[in-house]
Amino acid sequence: GLECDGKVNICCKKQFFVSFKDIGWNDWIIAPSGYHANYCEGECPSHIAGTSGSSLSFHSTVINHYRMRGHSPFANLKSCCVPTKLRPMSMLYYDDGQNIIKKDIQNMIVEECGCS
Amino acid sequence: GLECDGKVNICCKKQFFVSFKDIGWNDWIIAPSGYHANYCEGECPSHIAGTSGSSLSFHSTVINHYRMRGHSPFANLKSCCVPTKLRPMSMLYYDDGQNIIKKDIQNMIVEECGCS
């Protein structure tokens, strides 16, 4: 997956730091106070859909074969720049019952982006 | 994740059968001859982004909190209807060296869709 460098507008991973205070979650998330969540941004022209080598690649490559052949409804189905590899992170937080929990929360950090 | 029923245009899973002959892969995939790959389709209005209970939920909920607060660049970042749960499938195929391989291929079947 590409890292965004400002030079291309193709689907890439953009660095982004989330502050839990900014979104009002600091009253239930004890630690950390924030983290590098990152996000995905950019164009997904038809020739790169399903070519990210991502977890979606088999499925999206299959769909893209239909799309490229103008098969309805895939011809109009827009390929999207989305997280294709996410990583967990450990958090200390109050759960629904106000008990303190330390847990690895899945899919918190975007590691790679690709075209769906 | 919703199943598409023709009544709603909200992000949902659409049934779709892939024929390997249709996409010209029948010369290297021995079995099966095709499979129910399914795909994701539909709108992702802001109020359902990150509320799917999907594998993307923590990250997309975080981003949605910024989006709803009009935080640049998320205000313009479109939430996308994408696979959030994929399932493997066993395949019999010829590898690059024309050896016959039987393998579980990851992420072949879309089980659930959600808004990124």
């Epitope: 979104i23 009002g24 979650w25 600091n26 009253d27 239930w28 629904d96 019952g97 106000q98 929360i105 | 209005p45 802001s46 109020h47 359902i48 509320t51 209970g53 939920s57 923590f58 909920t61 909190h65 709803m68 607060r69």
Partner: antibody, heavy 124, light 107 residues
Framework: QVQLVESGGGVVQPGRSLRLSCAAS????????MHWVRQAPGKGLEWVAV????????YHADSVKGRFTISRDNSKNTLYLQVNSLRAEDTAVYYC?????????????????WGQGTTVTVSS | DIQMTQSPSSLSASVGDRVTITCRAS??????LGWYQQKPGKAPKRLIY???SLQSGVPSRFSGSGSGTEFTLTISSLQPEDFTTYYC?????????FGQGTKVEIK
């Protein structure tokens, strides 16, 4: 500490309207889903409505749909329930309740903090 | 809509008794269920969340179990302050729905 204080209840004639308010303090109001739950005299609890943390999504119980409207003003940390076309069966204590607008592993957060309630009496 | 059928509607017991209250959901709700205690003239207070987890600050004599459609609240040894009304709530899908309530009375 976390506090929810309801107001706006009273005695009202059938067919009339009221606006219930709930003032929130001690937490980041704009990050929580908010609900109204009511309880008729001597009866059980009935869920009435919910509004998402950002006001983008609302659900109402069938019994109040079209007559009651939930809303919020995050800048004032206040939740509202506009109650129109009141009926005798709407007589109840109305509670304002908080829930975290988040889910994880298909667990959806429930009702955790309740106000003390405001009483609405519909009588001619 | 999901119906929550709570039973019994009332029960008589003595201090020290073990009591069980049941809630049955008309369709599967995973573990999206809470148990609430309500004393006369007061707001409800949650005892159990996620079907089986004890709310912080609640005595350990209260416990919950179940998943899917069948749920129970158990009070292992009734104390004088436990003689009041209990409700279950499903928060799996809207509209959220409460059970009819169980009044625990002194025998």
């Amino acid at each position: 500490q976390v506090q929810l204080v309801e107001s706006g209840g009273g005695v009202v004639q059938p067919g009339r309207s009221l606006r219930l308010s709930c003032a929130a303090s001690g937490f980041t109001f704009s990050s929580y889903g908010m609900h109204w739950v009511r309880q008729a005299p001597g009866k059980g609890l009935e869920w009435v409505a919910v509004i998402w943390y950002d006001g983008s999504n609302k659900y109402h119980a069938d019994s109040v749909k079209g007559r009651f409207t939930i809303s919020r003003d995050n800048s004032k940390n206040t939740l509202y329930l506009q109650v129109n076309s009141l009926r005798a069966e709407d007589t109840a204590v109305y509670y304002c309740v908080r829930s975290r607008n988040w889910n994880y592993d298909n667990y959806y957060y429930g009702l955790d903090v309740w106000g003390q309630g405001t009483t609405v009496t519909v009588s001619s | 809509d999901i119906q929550m059928t709570q039973s019994p509607s009332s029960l008589s017991a003595s201090v020290g008794d073990r009591v069980t209250i049941t809630c049955r959901a008309s369709q599967g709700i995973r573990n999206n269920l809470g148990w609430y205690q309500q004393k006369p003239g007061k707001a409800p207070k949650r005892l159990i969340y996620a079907a089986s987890s004890l709310q912080s600050g609640v005595p350990s004599r209260f416990s919950g179990s179940g998943s899917g459609t069948e749920f129970t609240l158990t009070i292992s040894s009734l104390q004088p302050e436990d003689f009041t009304t209990y409700y279950c709530l499903q928060h799996n899908s809207y509209p959220w729905t409460f059970g009819q309530g169980t009044k625990v009375e002194i025998k």
